[in-house]
């Protein structure tokens, strides 16, 4: 089958990194500079992605693979293949239409990206607040008020970290 296919279509013999040049009797020509073909049998080579401005080159373009970009310091990637770069904020902030803004009271963000999320409501799990939340940190829930009977230890080791608002499984 491969042999018949080759007889029918000489382009199928052209490997990655080349293209089937119609102007030259369908011989396999190397991809020109700043272009690539990642599969065999291509009739054209694709233009390499250019990492410019806020984007920087993570991997150079080669004749067989496209360039890969990431973001310059102070920015982080968004979208498939890092199609966008978004400015970082500080912990305790979120990026809004008007720039980096502090998290509102009752919310926190422990990363340089993403949105402010509500503090965990300890009482939903029948627990009390052991450590108050801040703009940068979620509250730490402690034992339930009923557990704090006279003579009982008032401080217990914190439970393993979990997503705010989610009950333990």
């Amino acid at each position: 089958f491969e042999r018949t296919r080759s007889l029918q279509d000489p382009c199928s013999n052209c490997p990655a990194g080349t293209f089937c040049d119609n102007n030259r009797n369908q011989i396999c020509s190397p991809c020109p500079p700043n272009s690539f073909s990642s599969a065999g049998g291509q009739r054209t080579c694709d233009i390499c992605r250019q990492c410019k401005g806020v984007f920087r080159t993570r991997k150079e373009c080669s004749s067989t693979s496209n360039a890969e970009c990431d973001c310059t310091p102070g920015f982080h990637c968004l979208g498939a293949g890092c199609s966008m770069c978004e400015q970082d904020c500080k912990q305790g902030q979120e990026l809004t239409k008007k720039g980096c803004k502090d998290c509102c009271f009752g919310t926190f963000n422990d990363q340089k990206r993403g949105i402010c999320r509500p503090w965990t409501n300890c009482s939903l799990d029948g627990k009390s607040v052991l450590v108050n939340g801040t703009k940068e940190r979620d509250v730490v829930c402690g034992p339930s008020p009923a557990d704090l009977s006279p003579g009982a230890s008032s401080v217990t080791p914190p439970a393993p970290a979990r997503e705010p608002g989610h009950s333990p499984q």
Partner: nanobody, 122 residues
Amino acid sequence: EVQLLESGGGLVQPGGSLRLSCAASGFTFSSSAMSWARQAPGKGLEWVSGIYSGGSTYYTESVKDRFTISRDNSKNTVYLQMNSLKPEDTAVYYCATWGTLRFGVWAEYDHWGQGTLVTVSS
């Protein structure tokens, strides 16, 4: 071919003013949002200001009330008027298209100029 050419940079004393210009060609300027970014020596890039095609303007906190972005669609040019300049405004200033329309976000299809150096020093 898209081209963005910045001009107007230079040396200025603290408290002084400068107006940067960015002449655009190779695309439909009047319907494109535009932005300014800057990179201080040894620091990362910073989003400074943006202007929508309709004229709405956005600024990063540190330049609010001191910098003004504007555009002249008849001249395919965007401007950045910088007043009350401080030493910390020293940077290379870049003009860029702003296809995402989102504060602090650029996309891979955006185009960038080569930059113009602004030095604020006595």
